[in-house]
Interface confidence: low
């Protein structure tokens, strides 16, 4: 499919001008290659009329130009002094005319309306209001006032001062007679329809002395604004319908076959299932304007969109509307990233978020999409050290791997974490991407004790158990804070108060805190990574308390005395300890038990490797 995009239809009137914008992917090659506008012949060729290399056909001499805007990825063809001979099928394109890097444009130039003398022309947008003013002389002040519409050869009464209203105008028309001082009556028509267009005649009086005034009403269907966005990117539709509909329900719909317009989202709470998790309707301003953001653009999102206002929250005849033609460029600069990430309850996910690599200094954000009402996306974390309070200790945004991708890690997962999340920055708003987190059945791969209490001045070791499949990964412990998770040095990196030791045989990576102080209290994460790509993490909170007086019983030991069949959920190791109390031989078999479990984990993970659009908790 050609990535070139422009207006499918351009309509104008003889003598007028048109300006046609064509969009192209702004790659280095495209920015500098030839741009052209050609007319399609009956036999399939396309004859160049104007190009960016300076050529102008004699047909266009002195009345056309082509301007390239490489920074926007657009070029504009302006044609003046239009005649009906200019009607036809054209192409705007890049490179060679026959190469197919082009877009078909139909230009229709019509004759200007043949109007009677003294005809007032009213040009009004579809769905809006028109006021037709009708002057009269004093002798007709007390006589019947009326408005007719010319239908074919015959005038048809629309409204009159005796109270008649044509059924086609019921509920949306009124006749106002000004105060005695002004010799004028006016007819106000609301919620204009395309069928309202035509020639009108207003009349005061019915005899040969009546006053008459001709009016020509032109109802304009809004020209769609062309919107060119990248696949997987984001689009924002800004809809300003005017203060007169400020209190009317708003909608955005997508035109399907014919005149149907399927609601995408509206202010009455309706949302199309295809847009779940990737759409926000920003609440409207006092003047009735609002905007709709759609992320994670798909090929099938391309098409014509209308926003409007109607009490039903959907398109009806007479709704004021605004239109867009969305083209989704498949030659996207936005890299593929998983749209679904799976994690298990108690486990973690690492989400890769793309951003525009030209904006490496931009602030990165992650928010949780909420579908209630019109949708919103409250921030959970940013790259400047802010984390929403409820997520402290279990959420971190990392600038790694960098170069167009940042990482978000969320652990201690529960079913409540399932949902849609958005990656965004304070820079290029087109680079908003959506990922869905799904919570699936399974056990976390990394196991740490549930609660750890350290004693001031003593040494603490905290184990983290990992399965065979992570043997080749780098293991680490880090101390969580708002700005990230600061990795603690491993034992062989030299003496340190806090360090990490890994025993590959028992597959334990342990955190050691020497001479515990109050400053050591907090969240610690055990994790695995490959280079700058983060995998699973497990979190443990280390509480610090005073040394107890001699003879007082340590509550943490009491927990270990749980009955053998009791499932203590705060530790992956506790289950093994309890079995050992029951049967001392299990101490010797502890490693074997762990091995069996790990192999099961490994085989399960290999089955659910996920599609190219999905990513497991280990996020590669």
């Amino acid at each position: 499919k050609s990535p070139i995009f422009g207006p499918e239809e351009v309509n104008s009137v003889e003598g007028n001008s048109v300006s046609i914008t064509c969009y192209y992917p702004p790659t280095s090659v495209n920015r500098h290659t030839r741009k052209y506008w050609c007319r399609q012949g009956a036999r399939g060729g396309c004859i160049t009329l104007i190009s960016s290399e300076g050529y102008v056909s004699s047909k266009y001499a002195g009345r056309a130009n082509l301007t390239n805007f490489p920074e926007n990825g657009t070029f504009v063809v302006n044609i003046a002094q239009l005649s009906q001979d200019d009607s036809g099928r054209y192409k705007c394109g890049l490179g060679i005319n026959s190469r197919g890097l082009s877009f078909d444009v139909s230009l229709e130039v019509s004759q200007g309306p043949g109007l009677l003398n003294d005809t007032k022309v009213y040009t009004v947008d579809l769905g809006r209001t028109v006021t037709i003013n009708c002057p009269f002389k004093t002798e007709n002040a007390q006589k019947r006032k009326s408005l007719y519409k010319q239908i074919g050869l015959y005038p048809v009464l629309v409204i009159d001062s005796s109270g008649y209203v044509n059924p086609n105008y019921t509920g949306r028309i009124r006749l106002d007679i000004q105060g005695t001082g002004q010799l004028l009556f006016s007819v106000v028509i609301n919620q204009l329809r395309l069928s309202d267009a035509g020639q009108y005649l207003c009349q005061a009086g019915d005899d040969s002395n009546s006053n008459k005034k001709n009016a020509d009403l032109q109802v304009l269907k809004p020209e769609p604004e062309l919107v060119y966005e990248d696949l997987r990117g984001s689009v924002t539709f800004h809809c300003a319908l005017g203060p007169e509909v400020a209190n009317v329900a708003k909608f955005l719909c997508r035109q399907s076959s014919g005149e149907n317009c399927d609601v995408v989202v509206n202010t009455l709470g309706k949302r199309a299932p295809a847009f779940e998790g990737r759409i926000l309707l920003n609440p409207q301003d006092k003047d009735g304007s609002f905007s709709v953001v759609i992320t994670g653009l798909r090929k099938e999102d391309a098409g014509r969109y209308l926003c409007g206002a109607h009490s039903d929250g959907q398109l009806q005849e007479g709704s004021p509307i605004q239109a867009w033609q969305l083209f989704v460029n498949e030659e996207s600069t936005i890299p593929r990233s998983p749209t679904v990430v799976k994690g298990v309850a108690g486990g973690s996910v690492a989400v890769l978020c793309p951003y525009n690599r030209k904006e490496s200094k931009s602030i990165k954000y992650w928010c949780l999409w909420e579908g209630a009402q019109n949708g919103r996306c409250p921030l959970l974390v940013d790259s400047e050290g802010w984390v929403k309070a409820q997520y402290e200790g279990r959420l971190s945004l990392l600038e790694e791997p960098g170069n167009g991708t940042f990482t978000v890690i969320l652990n201690q997962l529960t079913s409540r974490d399932a949902g849609f999340y958005w990656c965004l920055t304070n820079g290029d708003t087109l680079w908003r991407t959506t990922v869905e987190i799904k919570i699936i059945e399974g056990e976390p791969n990394l196991k740490v004790p549930g609660n750890v209490t350290a004693v001031l001045g003593e040494t603490l070791k905290v184990p983290c158990h990992f399965p065979c499949k992570f043997s080749s990964y780098e293991k680490y412990w880090c101390k969580w804070n708002n700005t990230g998770c600061q990795a603690l040095p491993s034992q062989d990196e030299g003496p340190s108060k806090a360090f990490v030791n890994c025993d590959e045989n028992s597959r334990l990576v342990s955190l050691t805190l020497n001479l515990v102080t109050r400053a050591d209290e907090g969240w610690y994460w055990c994790g695995v990574k490959q280079g700058h790509f983060y995998g699973e993490t497990a979190a443990v909170y280390v509480a610090v308390e005073e040394r107890k007086a001699a003879g007082s019983r340590d509550v943490s030991l009491a927990k270990a005395d749980a009955a053998p069949d009791e499932k203590v959920l705060d530790s992956g190791f506790r289950e093994i300890e309890n079995k050992a109390i029951q049967d001392p031989r299990l101490f010797a078999e502890e490693k074997a038990v762990a091995d069996t479990r790990d192999q099961a984990d490994g085989s399960r993970a290999s089955v659910d490797s996920g599609s190219s659009e999905e990513q497991g908790g280990s996020s590669r």
């Epitope: 409207q284 301003d285 905007s291 954000y365 940013d382 400047e384 929403k388 309070a389 304070n426």
Partner: nanobody
Framework: QVQLVESGGGLVQAGDSLRLSCAAS??????????MGWFRQAPGKEREFVAS????????YYADSVKGRFTVTRDNAKNTVTLRMNSLKPADTAVYYC????????????????WGQGTLVTVSS
């Protein structure tokens, strides 16, 4: 464009209270999609962060110098954000500015996109 107009400034005695309001208007997205912040600038000094509040009003953040004395709230129905200042000190004398941001960030580096003109608060000893 978002327009912000502060009000409520004036001359008060040390130890008194004062309430500043900021009214938002404009044609862009609605008020309840913006995070709001308060800053102040004392004569001859740089503008400094005072407090911030997210769009829902659920998250607030304060500069250490005002913590416990100032409270920031918002009323999305009325498009206003309020800074309640108690136990005022002469050191609180400054022009107070209201700011709006398209995103909320707790901390003193509030990412303001729009600013008001300011309202003067003078605390005499």
């Amino acid at each position: 464009q978002v327009q912000l107009v502060e009000s409520g400034g004036g001359l008060v005695q040390a130890g008194d209270s004062l309430r500043l309001s900021c009214a938002a208007s404009g044609r862009t997205l609605s008020f309840d999609t913006y995070a709001m912040g308060w800053f102040r600038q004392a004569p001859g000094k740089e503008r400094e962060f005072v407090a911030s509040i997210d769009w829902s009003g659920g998250t607030t953040y304060y500069a250490d110098s005002v913590k416990g004395r100032f409270t920031v709230t918002r009323d999305n129905a009325k498009n206003t954000v309020t800074l309640r200042m108690n136990s005022l000190k002469p050191a609180d004398t400054a022009v107070y500015y209201c700011a709006a941001a398209q995103y909320y960030r707790s901390g003193t580096s509030f990412p303001a996109n729009y600013w008001g003109q300011g309202t003067l608060v003078t605390v005499s000893s």
